[in-house]
């Protein structure tokens, strides 16, 4: 913003108020003009002489029209678990938000006082409700015919796949397994031959990438492409 | 580019109040006062008054003072003008209008807000 | 307050003609503090001239604004079509602000 045009103080009609950008001095009885953000008040104004402005020095801020005799300190630089989305400038303080991942547990006026790491959901339980910036994610329980193999800070529980004929029943962290009941195509050295199941993933699944297994673990995955799913999730 | 997005017509009973809304875009709300003006139909401009959405600080002129209440949402940018115990007279069209910051001109206006008062 | 006055209510010009109305307070106003608006039928007025002399953004150059103290005044160089309005003064030299009832400028 532009410096206001200096102007001589004046007393306010009886009954009447200074205009905007301005404030009645009590000692000098007059209307003053008060200094633009980025500046604060280096002389207040008496009966004769308007209000001095000046700068803000390196590190301090003025948000606001003001006659305050200093300008207010930016906060301390955003701590590691942060990133600074507002620099320190002459008209407006540091502003520090939490990192993806994070969440902020302790909020100020502007930005974060505090981040906490998001809750990761352990295998058998899915998220209820997404972190957001200012509240932790929610884990559920996996509902019979759901699972959840990961420990994820995004991932819900997933319906079991269908099969013919299940070779191993699925629970809340592990998907159904089926038996294969037709030759399968050749897959890479190592790998399990396993059918295509009846059928993917419900309809009211959302896509979601391979489930990831522990070290050690070898999960019988379907072969071939498997269409995306449609819709989202249900609880 | 600076807006000024004003709510839609009110049409109110006499003796009712009214809360008109003025949204913000494309500058710092927080920065700039924003005025209200009242025209009647064929008539001439009329300040209400003004509010400074950074701290809150509003200005009226004396006739409007306890008709008008002036707020700002600054988490929204949208200031709001509430009209109360209104009659005939208070039909009119409310404008939101910035103050440039510098020579105390109007330099960008809301689309106005007609408010209708009839029983 | 500073009531402002301004003259004539109506007027009408031809195309090309030169056009000026006047604003007149009722105690002496700075000139940064004096500004002209301009306002079509079912639209919001339009900052036109702010500070006596000075064009806001896309305002032609055949406007023109001159004046001090209490006296002011809007010209118009060569009538448009365009130029058809009303046209208000408005004070913020002291508070409240005020407003000038309006010139409403007609093709003849």
């Known amino acids: 913003l532009p410096a206001q045009v200096a102007f001589t103080p004046y007393a306010p009609e009886p009954g009447g108020t200074c205009r905007l950008r301005e404030y009645y001095d009590q000692t000098a009885q007059m209307c003053c003009s008060k200094c633009p953000p980025g500046q604060h008040a280096k002389v207040f104004c008496t009966k004769t002489s308007d209000t001095v402005c000046d700068s803000c020095e390196d590190s301090t801020y003025t948000q606001l029209w003001n006659w305050v005799p200093e300008c207010l300190s930016c906060g301390s630089r955003c701590s590691s678990d942060q990133v600074e989305t507002q620099a320190c400038t002459r008209e407006q303080n540091r502003i520090c938000t939490c990192r993806p991942g994070w969440y902020c547990a302790l909020s100020k006026q502007e930005g974060c006082r505090l981040c906490a790491q998001l809750r990761k959901c352990r295998p058998g339980f899915g998220v209820a409700r997404p972190g957001t910036e200012t509240s932790d994610v929610v884990c559920k329980p996996c509902a019979p015919g759901t699972f959840s193999n990961t420990t994820s800070s995004t991932d819900i529980c997933r319906p079991h796949q269908i099969c013919h004929v299940v070779a191993i029943p699925g629970n809340a962290s592990m998907d159904a397994v089926c038996t294969s009941t037709s030759p399968t195509r050749s897959m890479a050295p190592g790998a399990v031959h396993l059918p295509q199941p009846v059928s993917t993933r419900s309809q009211h699944t959302q896509p979601t990438p391979a489930p990831s297994t522990a070290p050690g673990t070898s999960f019988l995955l379907p072969v071939g492409p498997s269409p995306p799913a449609e819709g989202s999730t249900g609880d | 580019e600076v807006q000024l997005q004003q709510s839609g017509a009110e049409l109110a009973r006499p003796g009712a109040s009214v809360m008109l809304s003025c949204k913000a875009s494309?500058?710092?709300?927080?920065?700039?006062?924003m005025q209200w003006l009242k025209q009647r139909p064929g008539q001439g401009l009329e300040w209400i008054g003004a509010?400074?959405?950074?701290?809150?600080?509003?200005r009226y002129t004396q006739k409007f003072k306890g008709k008008a209440t002036l707020t700002a949402d600054k988490s929204s940018s949208t200031a709001y003008m509430q009209l109360s115990s209104l009659a005939s007279e208070d039909s009119a069209v409310y404008y939101c209008?910035?103050?440039?910051?510098?020579?105390?001109?109007?330099?960008?206006w809301g689309q106005g807000t007609s408010v209708t008062v009839s029983s | 307050q500073i009531v402002l006055t301004q003259s004539p209510t109506i007027m009408s010009a031809s195309l090309g003609e030169r056009v000026t109305m006047t604003c007149t307070a009722s105690?002496?106003?700075?000139?940064?503090?004096l500004h002209w608006y301009q306002q079509k039928p079912g639209s919001s007025p339009k900052l036109w001239i702010y500070?006596?002399?000075n064009l806001a953004s896309g305002v032609p150059a055949r406007f023109s604004g001159s004046g001090s103290g209490t006296s002011y005044s809007l010209t118009i160089s060569s009538m448009e079509a365009e130029d058809a309005a009303t046209y208000y003064c408005?004070?913020?030299?002291?508070?409240?602000?005020?407003f000038g009832g309006g010139t409403k400028l007609e093709i003849k």
């Open positions: 494309g500058y710092t709300f927080t920065s700039y006062w």
């Open positions: 408005h004070q913020y030299h002291r508070s409240p602000p005020t």
């Open positions: 500070s006596t002399s």
């Open positions: 509010i400074y959405p950074g701290d809150g600080d509003t």
């Open positions: 209008v910035r103050d440039d910051g510098l020579y105390y001109a109007m330099d960008y």
């Open positions: 105690s002496s106003v700075s000139s940064s503090y």
